[in-house]
Interface confidence: low
């Protein structure tokens, strides 16, 4: 019997979380020609393996090297789609634009998308009544270390011209706190990368403003700028009709041009 | 860097109580074990109870049960053990000990505070 | 309650020498116990967690082996600094208890 109760502040293990990150790994292997090779109960062990038996605020980015190692996958240059508090927008487009990709379109993010997980130190067993909340707990808990050790590998192996959507309804069009913001901006290589393009997604139906002028967004102009990697800035105006002209791009209303340029 | 910065020395009558406080710094108070262990003069080490401070949860070694208090106030990241009915025997260093914990309550202790000494003495 | 009892209770050993520490558990404690070196004047610090995993920022030369009940701690090559004296804890069972403690003295 439990003589003290592990309570955290976030909420616990999504249920069902082996299963569901085992039916993944076996959907995508069978979708994805490539990762044909990839055995899912070896995948399952190393995530299992991460953090089964960790006290969750001790977790680190050496805990995931095993499973990152077996799910090692390439992005074609000028593939790579990063995203900022926009994931809903971004996945819809990568779903029409088959030949780009987010983070979740890969393997290890597609197993990990919108579950949460944690175990307990010493004992075998998976929490599911509570995990370390990042804010009100710590930083360094299961899912947010797999994250960051995700993102900055997925940043690493980028190549050529790399697009980023940002959220331009939120105060922080660019946020240095942000996955985006701390871990894929300085892991970009910029022996690799020649240019990083943002895309800056406007919510409101009447807005023309040029959020490519925000301060935020000169100030990843400037950081980026300063890693040698070239920066380049575009307003949607539109996302409805962006994912519309995505779709299709034959659309006589799309022909146009849809896209508000500035190139800096 | 993770602090545990203990209160100073006392001296106590017998029969009398006193409370030592554990004020921590550098890390998150609230996701850690507090415990407290004692050594007498020459001896070893021997750990009387703890406190979750995020859930207010406490357990003693049976030695102690019904003399020790823990209490945590989260507010300050200060933790609390409070020994009544003393007798010489309690003279001792006491050391609050941070630890991380499951829900079986196994820890270790990764952080120290410099320690208390109390003295019961008539 | 478990009963740790280590030895031996002083040990003599010359500065780069090997020094090997037991303990034992009156019963299996399975690999949930620690190691704490004390100076005189100072709190206890952790060395090894897990019967063998080093606490950060431990240098190599300390290692820990053994489950169940028969445990050891090894320091390699005894520095100036490592003279002092060391515990063992079990936290597999309720109260966790330490060892009496092995003193590490220069010979």
């Known amino acids: 019997v439990p003589r003290w109760r592990q309570q955290w502040s976030g909420s616990g293990t999504t249920s069902r979380f082996p299963e569901t990150v085992l039916a993944r790994c076996v959907k995508y292997t069978e979708v994805h020609p490539e990762m044909r090779h990839v055995d899912c109960q070896s995948v399952w062990d190393a995530f299992k393996g991460a953090f089964i038996s960790k006290y969750p605020c001790n977790i680190t980015e050496e805990d995931y090297q095993p499973l990152v190692k077996l799910g090692t996958q390439t992005v074609p240059c000028n593939k790579t789609l990063l995203w900022s508090r926009i994931k809903d927008l971004a996945h819809q487009f990568t779903q029409v634009q088959r030949d780009m990709f987010t983070l979740e379109d890969m393997l290890l993010g597609y197993l990990a998308d919108d579950l949460t997980w944690c175990g307990e130190f010493n004992t075998f067993e998976i929490n599911y009544q509570s995990c370390p909340d990042w804010r009100k707990d710590c930083s360094n808990n299961p899912v947010s270390v797999f994250w960051k050790t995700v993102s900055r590998r997925f940043a690493e192996t980028a190549c050529g011209v790399v697009h980023v959507m940002l959220n331009g309804s939120r105060s922080k069009i660019f946020d240095k706190n942000s996955t985006f913001g701390s871990v894929e901006v300085h892991n970009l290589q910029p022996e690799k990368v020649q240019a990083l393009e943002a895309w800056v997604i406007h919510g409101g139906r009447e807005d023309s403003r040029d959020l490519c002028q925000d301060p935020t967004i000169k100030e990843l102009e400037s950081i980026i700028s300063k890693r040698n990697i070239r920066f380049f800035c575009k307003n949607i105006y539109r996302p409805d009709k962006f994912l519309q002209c995505v779709k299709n791009p034959e659309d006589s209303s799309c022909l146009s041009g849809i896209h508000h340029h500035h190139h800096h | 860097q993770v602090q545990l910065v203990q209160s100073g020395a006392e001296v106590k009558k017998p029969g009398s109580s006193v409370k030592v406080s554990c004020k921590a710094s550098?890390?998150?108070?609230?996701?850690?074990?507090i415990s407290w262990v004692r050594q007498a003069p020459g001896q070893g080490l021997e750990w009387m109870g703890g406190?979750?401070?995020?859930?207010?949860?406490?357990d003693y070694a049976q030695k102690f049960q019904g003399r020790v208090t823990i209490t945590a106030d989260e507010s300050t990241s200060t933790a609390y053990m409070e020994l009544s009915s003393l007798r010489s025997e309690d003279t001792a260093v006491y050391y609050c000990a941070r630890g991380p914990y499951d829900s079986y309550g196994e820890s270790y202790f990764d952080y120290w505070g410099q320690g208390t000494l109390v003295t019961v003495s008539s | 309650e478990i009963v740790m009892t280590q030895s031996p209770a002083t040990l003599s050993v010359s500065p780069g020498e090997r020094a090997t520490l037991s303990c034992r558990a009156s019963?299996?404690?399975?690999?949930?116990l620690a190691w704490y070196q004390q100076k005189p004047g100072q709190a206890p610090r952790l060395l090894i967690y897990?019967?063998?995993t080093r606490a950060t920022g431990i240098p190599a030369r300390f290692s820990g082996s053994g489950s169940g009940t028969e445990f050891t701690l090894t320091i390699s090559s005894l520095q100036s600094e490592d003279f002092a004296v060391y515990y063992c804890?079990?936290?597999?069972?309720?109260?966790?208890?330490f060892g009496q403690g092995t003193k590490v003295e220069i010979k």
């Open positions: 897990g019967a063998s």
């Open positions: 804890q079990q936290y597999n069972n309720w109260p966790w208890t």
């Open positions: 550098g890390g998150s108070f609230s996701i850690y074990a």
């Open positions: 019963q299996s404690v399975s690999s949930n």
């Open positions: 406190i979750i401070p995020n859930s207010g949860d406490t």
